[in-house]
Interface confidence: medium
């Protein structure tokens, strides 16, 4: 969680002198309660906007908007504390609107906005606006909170933001999987335009249970420039047990911008549909056994055996 450093946030508007200050999230009115406190915000809304930095980066930001209730308590309103809590880390960031003049009723409802909290893809936040001073210990609450879910990098509008591009969002590997003869699986995907290694992970499951019965990891060395955007092929030798047939394939890149934290792309291959006449599998076959990690891995795979399944994934 952080604040945009440009442009400087503004809270002043016609009829109100105001400045935005960093806050410790612990307003003085908690420690020194006041007798008269303002009512709570009205119609708190949070939207996802996008902000360009001076360096040309594009970041998703939480656009916070609220209005004041039309009661006499605005005469005691000294400002507002805006708090954003990232739910999975409990990290909190606050700013304070400090009113430098008294509010007066005017012909339209007072409305405030703030768009400087930078948010992360696929994260959930709790946004709270507290009117200041905060209420006395047994007083009515004068804050409003809303949860806010930021789309992940798969989303078209998030895809072009700097944090998403840094994690490889623009790379579309277009993974295809072919089931070959002789217990083999060929995985093919498109390389990105960076000389960086990849890892292809295969994990197999039985159709009826969700425990893994086989797994293999294959490394692909960093491609040369002439191989950028070309297809890479990896062939896996599968478990010899026919029931270990539900395959989950992941391609993990190691781009320089995200290293071990790059977005992974995955595809699943379901077990083939079997007719009712199939011989039931022996009970012993249910014991998960690990196969030797064999099979070849390279860019060009001339093994052109007929495939029985084709699975595509974006």
């Amino acid at each position: 969680l952080r604040l945009l450093d440009f442009p400087a946030p503004v809270c002043a508007q016609e009829g109100l002198s105001c400045r935005v200050k960093n806050s410790t999230c612990l307003d003085d009115s908690w420690i020194h309660p006041r007798n008269l406190t303002p009512s709570s915000p009205k119609d708190l809304q949070i939207q996802l906007h996008f902000a360009h930095t001076q360096q040309g980066d594009l970041f998703p930001v939480a656009h916070i908007e609220w209005t004041l209730q039309t009661d006499a308590s605005i005469l005691y309103l000294e400002g507002a504390e805006l708090s954003v809590l990232q739910l999975n880390t409990n990290e909190r960031l606050c700013v304070r609107f400090e009113f430098l003049s008294k509010l007066r009723h005017h012909h339209r409802r007072w409305r405030f906005t703030f768009s400087h909290f930078v948010v992360d893809p696929d994260q959930e936040y709790e946004v709270t606006v507290h009117h200041l001073p905060k209420p006395i210990p047994d007083g009515d609450p004068n804050h409003q909170s809303k949860n806010f879910l930021v789309p992940d990098c798969e989303h078209a509008r998030m895809k072009v933001t700097t944090p998403c591009m840094s994690s490889g969002s623009l790379w579309d590997p277009n993974i295809t999987v072919e089931t070959l003869e002789a217990h083999q699986l060929r995985v093919s995907f498109t390389l990105w335009n960076e000389s960086t290694p990849y890892q292809v992970l295969l994990e197999s499951f039985s159709d009826s249970e969700n425990h893994s019965c086989f797994d293999v990891v294959k490394q692909i060395f960093a491609p040369r420039q002439e191989e950028f955007h070309q297809r890479a092929n990896v062939t896996f030798t599968l478990s010899k047990f026919h029931w270990c047939c539900h395959h989950h394939v992941q391609v993990q890149p190691f781009f320089s911008s995200c290293l071990n934290d790059c977005l992974r792309h995955a595809v699943t291959v379901p077990c083939p549909v079997i007719s009712n006449t199939t011989v039931p599998k022996p009970v012993a076959d249910y014991i998960p056994l690990w196969e030797p990690r064999s099979g070849s891995s390279d860019y060009k795979d001339d093994d052109d055996k007929g495939s029985s399944h084709h699975h595509h994934h974006h």
Partner: antibody
Framework: QVQLQESGPGLVKPSETLSLTCTVS????????WNWIRQSPGKGLEWIGD???????NYNPSLKSRVTISVDTSKNQFSLKLSSVTTADTAVYYC?????????????????????????WGQGTTVTVSS | DILMTQSPSSLSASVGDRVTITCRAS??????LGWYQQKPGKAPKRLIY???SLQSGVPSRFSGSGSGTEFTLTISSLQPEDFATYYC?????????FGPGTKVDIK
């Protein structure tokens, strides 16, 4: 209420550049994406590309090599340029706004995001490519 | 690109009929889908956004449902002004793509 109005020449010669402008009235161009879509005679709708008010663009890969979309926030306008046109580019060209990513108020105070899509369209302008 | 298919491509119906149009995406698009109505010589008009939310000002006889890859537009009781072509639009992945359209005409 926001309104969009396309403008530009109705006739363009093959190999030349088609230029259209969309003027936004009744609202600000800020915090929205602005799209160009076309519809060839008797055909379906094809998204050409879009521009964010800050200048970031996305183009349809099928047209990317020929398309440029730009924005002029001071005039509340955005523009389309399509180079090296052929008769296949004869179509009705629409400009459209698509909304901010916003939030749907679910149960209680919980908010889920949704993405508005194209909510406001211009009435369209016919462009014929012919010598 | 995500391919959007619509069925049927055309249908004939009478005033008062219940009409259902289906749109399928070639891959999952969550609920990032809108339904549009277009009449001859006019721009498309959005009826449904986020797969199931009714656009402000649109009659409640229009409804949308679905998520992922399969979506439905339903007109509960067809009115004379509803005879038009209907398109779905996915805006989950670039390039955004429209369905080929479903023409609803008078039986």
């Amino acid at each position: 209420q926001v309104q969009l109005q396309e403008s530009g020449p109705g006739l363009v010669k093959p190999s030349e550049t088609l230029s259209l402008t969309c003027t936004v009235s009744g609202g600000s161009i800020s915090n929205y994406y602005w799209n160009w879509i076309r519809q060839s005679p008797g055909k379906g709708l094809e998204w050409i590309g879009d521009i964010y008010y800050s200048g970031s663009t996305n183009y349809n890969p099928s047209l990317k090599s020929r398309v440029t979309i730009s924005v002029d926030t001071s005039k509340n306008q955005f523009s389309l340029k399509l180079s090296s046109v052929t008769t296949a580019d004869t179509a009705v060209y629409y400009c459209a706004r698509d909304g901010e990513l916003a939030n749907y108020y679910g149960s209680g105070s919980y908010q889920f995001y949704y993405y508005y899509g194209m909510d406001v369209w211009g009435q369209g302008t016919t462009v014929t490519v012919s010598s | 690109d995500i391919l959007m298919t619509q069925s049927p491509s055309s249908l004939s119906a009478s005033v008062g009929d219940r009409v259902t149009i289906t749109c399928r995406a070639s891959q999952g698009i969550r609920n990032d889908l809108g339904w549009y109505q277009q009449k001859p010589g006019k721009a498309p008009k959005r009826l449904i956004y986020a797969a199931s939310s009714l656009q402000s000002g649109v009659p409640s006889r229009f409804s949308g449902s679905g998520s992922g890859t399969e979506f439905t537009l339903t007109i509960s009781s067809l009115q004379p002004e509803d005879f038009a072509t209907y398109y779905c639009l996915q805006h989950n992945s670039n390039p955004f793509t429209f369905g080929p359209g479903t023409k609803v005409d008078i039986k």
